[in-house]
């Protein structure tokens, strides 16, 4: 389980009218459910139940976003429509270039994501918890356009991007 270095870039307009980027760094873990790869895309917050919908149209998302899912306490959803791994798969099927799970409320999800899968996803599935998760969700809950960059090594420079 390697460390995932996540940079969250917020686009803010400055008084001069230009756009400034603010970068926040946090760490998570690459789970065995996905690949240990770099990925980047606009952050799209997804409700766990939102991943239950299986309409054809819902699979026609544009490619290249990073899904952020805050998992709820298991007792709030005793009969989930999909396993955590199933939810990650559904997000990737819809065009997510990576999925980040906040497992703070549901630490059991870590074991589910790390069960050796014969067919792991070809995109990264990262989990965050504790202070890093709080930091991430604080940014995600702002009404701002934000991009996440996930890397499997510490970022060399704060503005580094990589190919999708």
């Amino acid at each position: 389980k390697e460390t995932a270095f996540v940079e969250v870039v917020l686009f803010e307009s400055s008084p001069s009218g230009d756009y400034t980027t603010y970068t926040t760094g946090l760490t998570g873990r690459f789970s065995r459910a996905g690949a240990t790869l770099s990925a980047e895309g606009e952050i799209v917050q997804m409700h766990p139940l939102g991943l239950c919908n299986n309409n054809d149209e819902e699979d026609l998302y544009e490619y290249g976003w990073v899904g952020v899912v805050k998992l709820e306490q298991p007792e709030l959803d005793p009969k989930p429509c999909l396993t955590v791994l199933g939810k990650a798969k559904r997000a990737v099927q819809r065009g997510a270039t990576a999925v980040i799970f906040d497992v703070s409320e549901n630490p059991e999800a870590i074991d589910q994501l790390n069960q050796g899968s014969e067919d792991p996803l070809k995109r990264p599935v990262v989990y965050v918890k504790g202070a890093d998760a709080i930091k991430l969700m604080n940014i995600v809950n702002k009404q701002k356009v934000a991009r996440a960059r996930i890397q499997h090594r510490p970022p060399r420079q704060p503005t580094e991007y990589f190919d999708m």
Epitope: E42, V44, L60, E62, V145, A146, Y161, D163
Partner: antibody, heavy 116, light 107 residues
């Protein structure tokens, strides 16, 4: 079937305001980012504004401070408020779905003509 | 803001010919560039995203490549239905910017 239908265009005098709407159907509107793109008659495409699914916004330099993009998820509708209009804002205005970029789904466009 | 220079602005080509359109950016945008096709009187459609990925249902004669800050759209063998305007869009840095377009016409 994904559908985007723009409305609200028309003839308006310089300095006046107009509000464009884009009605969405066939997908979960609240989950998606949305763009406005415009095209002056016989000219190229000009990216105008974007709103994320959590209502974060970004604008092109040409419209920042004059135009406002917004959305009403309960009505599956995207808006573009055009203030202090100039003759150079004359164009067909398209709405398009997409996160990082305008994707496969665009509306047919609504024509805004700014003239005295 | 990132400048996108598209060339040529117009292009005359024969059916079956190989066609290449180029976009050059003022700074590195990695592969954050799309190509759109717009036929006369129609709405633009997404052709290629992230520089090289062909949009579903688009013919395989279209392809995208890039090297550094230079991006190319290639049509391997021109068909009558390919007569259109072509635009590139950088979406690496906000605000996003389109190239000025290329008008592709039959010789």
């Amino acid at each position: 079937e994904v559908q985007l239908v723009e409305s609200g265009g028309g003839l308006v005098q310089p300095g006046k305001s107009l509000k464009l709407s884009c009605s969405a159907s066939g997908f979960t509107f609240s989950s998606h980012g949305m763009h406005w793109i415009r095209q002056a008659p016989g000219k190229g495409l000009d990216w105008v504004a974007y709103i994320s699914n959590n209502s974060g916004t970004i604008y092109s330099a040409a419209v920042r401070g004059r135009f406002t993009i917004s959305r009403d998820n309960s009505k599956n509708t995207l808006f573009l408020q055009l203030n202090s209009l100039k003759s150079e804002d004359t164009a067909i205005y398209y709405c398009a779905r997409g996160y990082n970029y305008p994707g496969a789904y665009w509306g047919q466009g609504t024509l805004v003509t700014v003239s005295s | 803001d990132i400048q996108v220079t598209q060339s040529p602005s117009s292009l005359l080509a024969s059916l079956g010919e190989r066609v290449t359109i180029t976009c050059q950016t003022s700074q590195s945008i990695r592969n954050y560039l799309n190509w759109y096709q717009q036929k006369p009187g129609q709405v633009p459609i997404l052709l290629i995203y992230y520089a090289t990925s062909l949009q579903t249902d688009m013919p395989s004669r279209f392809s995208g490549q890039y090297s550094g800050r230079s991006f190319t759209l290639t049509i391997t063998s021109l068909e009558p239905e390919d007569i259109a305007n072509y635009f590139c869009l950088q979406h690496y840095s906000v605000p996003y910017t389109f190239g000025a377009g290329t008008k592709l016409e039959l010789k």
